[in-house]
């Protein structure tokens, strides 16, 4: 769920999760266009991960799962079901992805009308 996403990003990364709430074309609710930088690519990948999970019948935004933050690393589990495992992996991936990026202030509160209608395909 959203709480876990914020928690995992905060666990691994050097920045508050709030820094990604309205960033580039993909960080925040929804998203379309060409990702603007490495952070935006992380968010695009996470959108793809959530979409795959949704297609499998999971509810990414609302399903809770268990995880631990150990030495700035996300440890998933114990999972009660496959969705919890999948969603924790999605959030773990974006947390690790974002932790390796540089922050470009010019993409914070980026105007959505500048984002193209078409998006890169998911892997």
């Amino acid at each position: 769920g959203i709480l876990e996403l914020a928690g995992t990003v905060g666990c691994v990364g050097p920045r508050t999760p709030i820094a990604y709430m309205k960033y580039g074309c993909f960080c925040g609710l929804g998203g379309h266009g060409q990702p603007r930088d490495a952070i935006d690519w992380c968010c695009h990948g996470h959108d793809c991960c959530y979409t795959r999970a949704e297609e499998a019948g999971c509810s990414p935004k609302t399903e809770r799962y268990s995880w631990q933050c150990v030495n700035q690393s996300v440890l998933c589990g114990p999972a009660e079901n496959k969705c919890q495992e999948l969603l924790c992996k999605c959030d773990q991936e974006i947390a690790n992805c974002l932790a390796q990026t540089e922050y470009n202030l010019k993409y914070l509160f980026y105007p959505q009308f500048l984002c193209e209608p078409d998006s890169p395909k998911c892997d």
């Epitope: 795959r52 999970a53 297609e55 499998a56 019948g57 999971c58 009660e80 079901n81 496959k82 495992e85």
Partner: antibody, heavy 118, light 107 residues
Framework: QVTLKESGPGILHPSQTLSLTCSFS??????????VGWVRQPSGKGQEWLAH???????YYNPPLKSRLTISKDPSKNQVFLTIPNVNTANTATYYC??????????WGQGTTLTVSS | DIQMNQSPSSLSASLGDTITISCHAS??????LSWYQQKPGNIPKLLIY???NLHTGVPSRFSGSGSGTGFTFTISSLQPEDIATYFC?????????FGGGTKLELK
Amino acid sequence: QVTLKESGPGILHPSQTLSLTCSFSGFSLNTFGLGVGWVRQPSGKGQEWLAHIWWDDDRYYNPPLKSRLTISKDPSKNQVFLTIPNVNTANTATYYCTQILPHWVAYWGQGTTLTVSS
Amino acid sequence: DIQMNQSPSSLSASLGDTITISCHASQNINVWLSWYQQKPGNIPKLLIYKASNLHTGVPSRFSGSGSGTGFTFTISSLQPEDIATYFCQQGQSYPFTFGGGTKLELK
């Protein structure tokens, strides 16, 4: 159209090994999010979940039965297998193969009946 | 394991009636409850998933509701082809577990 069909020995003697095969069509077990599971139902009783296997080869076994069950798959042949060694009369039941998603059973096979009798 | 308590175990109704079946989970299963129909000698069929979502091709007279531990399955305007056994299944926590079933008969 998704179909699943179970095949098994029908009758076994106590201490023999049960080998079940599920042959399916209409989906691939290489598809993200899909799994195949086994359920059994003794006559006049409720269903019991045995085991399932996912597209990514992750396997789940019902804990009390874990040491006695083996589930495997051959996605190229669209088949899933379940073995239970050393059966006894408590294993007499109808065994169903199912297509599953993470939270529910989407499709069931017709079932295969096993009788364990000395 | 999560226990699923389904009631009633049997039910007599007339054509055109509205019938209701309940399923109670021993712990919170959020919305992860499914309902199935099984006719004698036939394969069980998924009717409803995620508590209230109709599976493809299922008539709209079937409906489901509930969340947490209490769930309800309803058939409005009972048809002859609805005579069957109905059972619920929780999908919150493995192993999947099932209700004991409700055998629906005509009065």
